[in-house]
């Protein structure tokens, strides 16, 4: 007769491994027990548990309510024991030493291999601002047996960089995420892509890219400056900029105060009907937590009694 | 015939210490485990020590570890007890018996001894 | 320890009768379990291993059952010479513990 085993059982983490030892004998032959033990290199042998055909299953202490057979039906020539629940400590060299009448013992060794899935974790890099160079956008970690695969799937231009972490029983695989921060990231996702034999399926944590930045400022509602002329109604300022966080508008009069009636919306200004006293040089100031940006206009409204032609000048300054 | 034969028993004093023996007969002595089973007066039975075929493993049982020493002497086919620090609580027949099958953990005695008694008391 | 339950702690029987005497374990001993029957002023005798197995030389009047935790003596029956005092003993785990023992009388 021979035993019938595996070369190596691969279990998850929390699941029950399957130990088989199966002796193929001949005719009339009998198993009278099957003990399994663990036998790791440089360590005396472990019992684990005896499959006494008369006595039945014996477990143990230190593996007491972890060992069981398979459920029935059983044959008797079959040795195999169920490890309940697995933890990585489980993992290592199994050994079934099977005795039989009359052919005597056999024994096979088989190795337990535990994976241990990873549980990834996503950390953010600093503050990416528009302007900077090569920047740590993220940094992905994952730990597990055997070590899993770390991996970037995102539209954004990038480079990555992983380093490898071994302890005794698992490894740790940190990637780093770096880019040059532009405005156009923003709202782009990168994600983090963790592969291991103990996952049905890769695990993806996804982070969304906020990159700050302020655009420059300008200022419309002069473009036909005939427009501007004394009793107009309706006539507005409006400051355009773009930027993340979104930007505040605060208008102010560079050479006096805003005039009466001039009514502040946001990054409008709003004038009452044109008189000559709502001309002057007007600054829409933008900022955010980022940066700031300034642009000025020079308002000349026109008295239509006047021959002389409206003169307006746009001054953009940051 | 299988025949196990206690001795050594009888009347001591609280602290006193006394070797009980069993000669075995009718078997290879070698092939087997041995234990010790006691029964107080009027009470059940309790099982008070076991040794290992070549003497090289031993148990006891909480009530008299560190007082009592299991041993054997295989070349003349006999087992002992060696009780110390003896109490009332000791007091019982005490019977040397036979294991079925050799193994580190349980068995069951398939031959018992007639039993002797031992008395503590002052 | 694990300990062992019997019941009864006695019974009184007549001659012929079939009479069953279970013992529980406080935890699972598979078929760990071994049936003595002592009669007084004598040595214990095995009569059951492996919770099921007649010992050589037992009459076949005797048999046992049950696993894990419980577990029976039958005795189809009852002789004169069955009246005595009956043990089941585990032998799972160290140290190896007896039931309180179940004492069989006529009635």
């Known amino acids: 007769g021979e035993l019938e085993t595996s070369d190596v059982v691969t279990v998850v983490l929390g699941q029950d491994a399957k130990l088989p030892c199966f002796y193929r004998g001949d005719s009339g032959e009998q198993v009278g027990q099957v003990a399994w033990a663990r036998v790791d290199a440089g360590e005396g042998a472990q019992e684990l548990a005896l499959l006494h055909s008369k006595y039945g299953l014996h477990v143990s202490p230190a593996y007491e309510g972890r060992v069981e057979q398979p459920p029935p039906p059983r044959n008797p020539l079959d040795g195999s024991v169920l490890l309940r629940n697995a933890v990585q400590a489980d993992e290592g060299e199994y050994e079934c030493r099977v005795s039989t009448f009359p052919a005597g013992s056999f024994q096979a060794r088989l190795r337990l291999r535990v994976l241990v899935p990873p549980l990834p974790s996503l950390n953010p890099g600093p503050a990416l601002e528009e302007g900077q160079g090569l920047t740590l956008a993220a940094s992905c970690t994952a730990e597990g047996s055997p070590a899993p695969s770390v991996t970037w799937d995102t539209e954004v231009k990038g480079t990555t960089s992983s380093r490898s972490f071994k302890h005794s029983r698992s490894a740790a695989v940190t990637s780093e995420f770096h880019l040059v921060p532009s405005r156009s990231m923003n709202g782009q996702p990168l994600t983090c892509v963790v592969s291991h034999p103990g996952l049905l399926q890769d695990q993806r944590i996804t982070h969304i890219l906020h990159v700050s930045f302020l655009a420059e400022a300008s200022v419309r509602g002069l473009e036909d400056q005939n427009l501007w002329h004394i009793g107009r109604e309706g006539a507005m300022l409006k400051c355009l900029s773009e930027g993340q966080p979104p930007p505040s508008y605060n208008w102010t009069r560079l050479d006096g105060p805003l005039p009466s009636g001039v009514r502040v919306d946001g990054d409008t200004l709003g004038f009452p009907p044109l008189t000559t006293e709502h001309s002057g040089i007007y600054v829409c100031h933008v900022s955010n937590e980022f940066s700031s940006r300034d642009s000025q206009v020079t308002v000349d409204v026109l008295d239509p009694q006047e021959d002389s032609g409206k003169q307006v000048d746009l001054v953009s300054a940051s | 015939e299988v025949q196990l034969v206690e001795s050594g028993g009888g009347l001591v004093q609280p602290g006193g210490s006394l070797r009980l023996s069993c000669a075995a007969s009718g078997y290879i002595f070698t092939n087997y485990a041995m234990s010790w089973v006691r029964q107080a007066p009027g009470k059940g039975l309790e099982w008070v020590s076991r040794?290992?075929?070549?003497?090289?493993?031993?148990d006891y049982a909480d009530s008299v570890k560190g007082r009592f020493t299991i041993s054997r002497d295989n070349s003349k086919n006999t087992l002992y007890l060696q009780m110390n620090s003896l109490r009332a609580e000791d007091t019982a027949v005490y019977y040397c018996?036979?294991?079925?099958?050799?193994?580190?953990?349980?068995?069951?005695?398939?031959?018992w001894g007639q039993g002797t008694l031992v008395t503590v008391s002052s | 320890d694990i300990q062992m339950t019997q019941s009864p702690s006695s019974l009184s029987a007549s001659v012929g009768d079939r009479v069953t005497i279970t013992c529980r374990a406080s935890?699972?001993?598979?078929?760990?379990l071994a049936w003595y029957q002592q009669k007084p002023g004598k040595a214990p005798k095995l009569l059951i291993y492996?919770?099921?197995s007649l010992q050589s030389g037992v009459p076949s009047r005797f048999s046992g059952s049950g696993s894990g935790t419980d577990f029976t003596l039958t005795i189809s029956s009852l002789q004169p010479e069955d009246f005595a005092t009956y043990y089941c003993?585990?032998?799972?785990?160290?140290?190896?513990?007896f039931g309180q023992g179940t004492k069989v009388e006529i009635k």
């Open positions: 935890q699972g001993i598979s078929s760990y």
């Open positions: 040794i290992s075929q070549s003497g090289g493993t031993n």
């Open positions: 492996a919770a099921s």
């Open positions: 003993q585990q032998h799972y785990t160290t140290p190896p513990t």
């Open positions: 018996a036979r294991q079925t099958e050799d193994r580190s953990y349980g068995y069951d005695l398939d031959y």
